[in-house]
Interface confidence: low
């Protein structure tokens, strides 16, 4: 079964989240300063004149950049797409960032960078105070407070309305941690298997407390070489594993929730090009806890892989959790050849 | 006894670590690029003239800030002050930093940002190439690898001289593990009694993987609403918690140590202002491990807490732990009134 | 190079006590553990105890109620004891070395050239 | 106390074969398990730590996994100097305890 049932489509997580209709209240956007208090907080909502017609920082944004804008989604929200303004103000305004960066973070505690697949956080904003600019973020975040940090090249007035675009993360997974990709090396090509937007931490082969590729709703193609995403390189979509850095035979990962769930069923979307070394997991075991600091409870739940290995299209697998509750969850994938690629991992949970 | 016996005193803790009197060798200086030989890290010793005399990097450092300068000092050190200085040579050299920002790293894989007690990062540099500039820093860091990221705000060379001065980390404290400081609500104030100088990670809310305020030889005063530091807020020496949020009736921490040691003395500096809440603890409980994947060893150190604990006055108490070996130690201390306030632990081993 | 030399009687008297000495050279006891180990052809290889660097002393709980374990590290010495010994004591003895620094923290990777003992009247 | 059970008991072997001797712990002890060889009238010698970590000096033909319970060793290529007894045993907690051996015998 090769598509994801249940799992979030990110073509279609592209609703307004509530500045411009108000459904985000003003008491959820705030600012790091205001120019006054009619360019204050609640004048940042796209398409909005209300007072002077805009939120504009107290102070100049060159060259520090610390001014910012907040917006408290209040849960944990997909967030695909952003929307810029200046400050219109029916003419009378001229002010708005020509660039500015986003940061994000899921508890308010941890701030990361929005970047781009190529590592760069400025992103290109308006070129005039009326028109609105949407942004397509590739890779989306996974966030419940997001920052927009207004840039300028010289000492100027900068004045920002926004919009954010996306739907509420259901999943509710808030991080996994997994031993870091590896590369491929085949005859004529690399293959960078790492999960190149991954938002946590890396120490010591092993990366976590974040979110990457396969939390981000894109699944990988049949031949793991190619990529639904343009201008990048071979192995993108996929996050992969060599059995030969295992010598325990299995990948193990930890997935982090954000509350107590009862886990019906773990979607793994899987390369099987095994004319290339890729293949299904063998099997999965998975154990549960509660808390971060109690003991995975009792057995695993195991599933043993049969059926169509041969064929070599990627597909999805599902793994029956059996109802297990848990806020914790640790799977072990066992090898079946000499690769494991993932490109996706989702839960259906209530 | 209100003192901390054996205890660091930072006041002293301000030798030259080796830059300039070259105990620092070359190979422990690196940079992330030079602009020729004759600025290369070699040359970034304080009041040094060798070569064109000061480190430069190759490229601008606006406006990404990414060149930097690494000092290796091989084992764990407090590092208390930097000074620096730009390229005077003999007048010829007018290239300075006016400001920069402090990595550091305990590992070699981990780096942290130093920031000011205000979390602010960046620090003030030079205003002339030749002069010496000294910042106090404040937390200091305990690091073995330190990296000076020199700043500018427009694009303009920089050039750089350093000297680390501080001490070295005998107690070989690596990181403690405890829960999230609280807030005390006192009728005329909030008191918070959160780690803020906390340099690991915080999850579950609870803090592990880092040093901070218990950790910076900053014992706290009686009045725990008071503090040794300027412009901070009240409780700022202090971490404290409610019995009410730990239904088990104890704080439970963890130490993590650089090697294994055989453990005389823990030493914990508590608040005892008994008339706003905060007591001594009742007891201590501690155990031990020599790695990381071992169990706790066998029955538990206790020292029960009597004497003068109507006395309000802050103190540091000693707890006796019998010469046990580990590089782990987990300590519970009992509450015997609505809150524990520490301010600083240490440890006596060999 | 690293040596653990063993001396001690190959003959003891049941109830009686056994001691047996090991000499170290090559290294010195900082950063290491001495183990003890015994092997019997019933048993297989048995664990007893351990002195740590500082003096420090782990047993077997089986075997806590009479075994000492000591040092005298001038001397690069350790001492093991085993009181009461019965027949089924029969074994071959080891002392081994174990590292206990993070960055070489192996397993046993010197051992003694054993000490044989035949528990016997 | 941890009890490693270790499979099986005698190999008969000739040379050039590929050996594989398991353990497995009665509850996880991470990877802190360790094999040694003992030949006759000899003292065990360490060959591999933390599961799979090669000692110093020990050939290359000479392997060691697992993590948890179940660990593996095996001797790729078998040579008439690896006939002995190996024997597996757990770092993790004490009491440390040992696996009963495996003796490796010539056809």
């Known amino acids: 079964d090769a598509d994801m049932k249940g799992h979030f489509d990110p073509a279609k997580c592209r609703y307004a989240l509530g500045m411009q209709d108000r459904t985000i209240p003003d008491s959820d956007i705030s600012v790091s300063s205001s120019w006054s208090d009619s360019t204050a907080a609640r004048h940042s909502r796209l398409e909005s004149s209300d007072g002077d017609g805009a939120w504009c920082p107290a102070g100049p944004v060159f060259p520090k950049e610390e001014e910012y804008l907040q917006v408290d989604l209040r849960r944990l929200h997909l967030v695909a797409l952003v929307g810029t303004q200046g400050r219109h103000a029916g003419g009378l305004g001229k002010e708005f960032s020509r660039s500015y960066r986003l940061r994000y973070s899921r508890d308010g505690r941890r701030w990361m960078d929005w970047k781009d697949r190529w590592g760069q956080e400025v992103i290109s904003g308006n070129e005039d105070p009326g028109g609105v600019v949407l942004k397509d973020l590739g890779p989306p975040m996974v966030a419940r407070l997001v920052r927009f940090y207004p840039r300028a090249d010289r000492v100027m007035s900068v004045c920002l309305r926004v919009e954010l675009y996306g739907c509420l993360w259901r999943d509710g997974l808030l991080s996994y941690t997994a031993p870091v990709g590896q590369t491929m090396q085949l005859s004529e090509v690399m293959v960078h298997l790492n999960d190149s937007t991954y938002d946590g931490y890396t120490a010591g082969g092993l990366q976590y407390g974040g979110l990457g590729q396969l939390a981000d709703g894109v699944v990988g193609l049949d031949d793991f070489r190619q990529s639904q995403e343009l201008r990048v390189w071979p192995g993108y979509d996929y996050v992969g594993w060599s059995n030969q850095s295992f010598p325990t035979g299995y990948v193990e990962m930890e997935f982090e929730f954000d509350r107590l769930r009862t886990f019906q069923t773990m979607q793994v979307h899987c390369n099987n090009m095994h004319t290339l070394g890729a293949r299904l997991p063998g099997g999965v075991e998975c154990r549960f806890k509660r808390g971060p600091a109690m003991a995975w409870e009792g057995e695993p739940v195991r599933h043993a892989l049969g059926g169509s290995l041969g064929d070599p299209r990627a597909r999805a697998i599902s793994v029956p959790l059996g109802g297990h509750v848990g806020r914790f969850l640790q799977c072990r994938f066992l090898f079946a050849g000499p690769w494991l690629l993932f490109s996706e991992i989702s839960f259906i949970s209530d | 006894d209100a003192d901390m016996k054996g205890h660091f005193d930072p006041a002293k803790c301000r030798y030259a670590l080796g830059m300039q009197d070259r105990t620092i060798p070359d190979s422990d200086i690196s940079v992330s690029s030079s602009w020729s030989d004759s600025t290369a890290a070699r040359h970034s010793r304080l009041e040094s003239s060798d070569g064109d005399g000061a480190w430069c990097p190759a490229g601008p450092v606006f406006p990404k800030e990414e060149e930097y300068l690494q000092v290796d000092l091989r084992r764990l050190h407090l590092v208390a002050l930097v000074g620096t200085q730009g390229r005077h040579a003999g007048g010829l050299g007018k290239e300075f930093s006016r400001s920069y920002r402090l990595r550091y790293s305990r590992d070699g894989r981990r780096w942290m940002d130093w920031k000011d007690r205000w979390g602010q990062e960046v620090i003030s540099g030079n205003e002339d190439p030749g002069g010496v500039v000294l910042k106090d820093l404040g937390p200091p860091m305990v690091a073995r690898l330190v990296r000076f990221y020199p700043r500018a705000d427009r694009v303009m060379s920089v050039c750089l001289r350093v000297e680390l001065y501080g001490c070295l980390w005998r107690d070989g404290l690596l990181s403690y593990t405890a829960p999230v400081g609280q807030t005390m609500q006192l009728s005329e104030v909030m008191v918070h009694l959160n780690d803020s100088t906390y340099d690991g990670y915080t999850a579950g809310g609870l803090q592990y993987g880092g040093l901070g305020q218990l950790a910076d030889g900053v014992v706290g005063l009686d009045d725990f609403r008071q503090s040794q530091e300027l412009r901070v807020w009240p409780g700022y020496d202090y971490v404290g918690w409610s019995n009410q949020s730990f239904p088990t009736g104890y704080v439970e921490m963890e130490f993590e140590f650089d090697r294994l040691r055989t453990f005389q003395t823990m030493q914990v500096h508590c608040n005892n202002m008994h008339t706003l809440g905060a007591r001594l603890p009742g007891g201590v409980e501690c155990r031990f491990k020599r790695g990381p994947a071992m169990a706790w060893e066998g029955e538990p150190v206790r020292h029960a807490l009597g004497g003068s604990l109507g006395d309000p006055r802050a103190r540091a108490i000693s707890v006796p732990l019998g010469g046990h070996v580990g590089r782990f130690l987990q300590c519970r201390f009992l509450f015997a009134g609505p809150w524990l306030l520490f301010s600083e632990i240490s440890f006596i081993s060999d | 190079q690293v040596q653990l030399k063993q001396s001690g009687p190959g003959l003891v008297q049941p109830s009686q006590s056994l001691s047996i000495t090991c000499t170290v050279s090559g290294f010195s006891f900082t950063g290491y553990g001495i183990h003890w180990v015994r092997q019997s052809p019933g048993k297989g290889l048995e664990w007893l105890g351990v002195?740590?660097?500082?003096?420090?002393?782990d047993y077997n709980a089986a075997f806590i109620s009479r075994l000492s374990i000591s040092m005298d590290s001038s001397k690069g010495q350790v001492f093991f004891k085993m009181n009461s010994l019965q027949a089924n004591d029969t074994a071959i003895y080891y002392c081994?070395?174990?590292?206990?620094?993070?960055?070489?923290?192996?397993?046993?990777?010197?051992w003694g050239q054993g000490t044989s003992v035949t528990v016997s009247s | 106390s941890i009890v490693m059970t270790q499979t099986p008991k005698f190999l008969l072997v000739s040379a050039g074969d590929r050996v594989t001797i398991t353990c497995k712990a009665s509850?996880?002890?991470?990877?802190?398990v360790a094999w040694y060889q003992q030949k006759p009238g000899q003292s065990p010698k360490l060959l591999i730590y933390y599961a799979s970590n090669r000692y110093t000096g020990v050939p290359d033909r000479f392997t060691g996994s697992g993590y948890g319970t179940d660990f593996t060793f095996t001797i790729n290529t078998v040579q008439a100097e690896d006939l002995a007894v190996y024997f597996c045993q757990q770092d993790y907690t004490s009491p440390l305890t040992f696996g009963a051996g495996t003796k490796l015998e010539l056809k």
């Open positions: 002195i740590w660097s500082g003096g420090i002393t």
């Open positions: 081994a070395r174990r590292s206990t620094t993070v960055v070489a923290d192996y397993a046993m990777d010197y």
């Open positions: 509850q996880s002890v991470s990877n802190d």
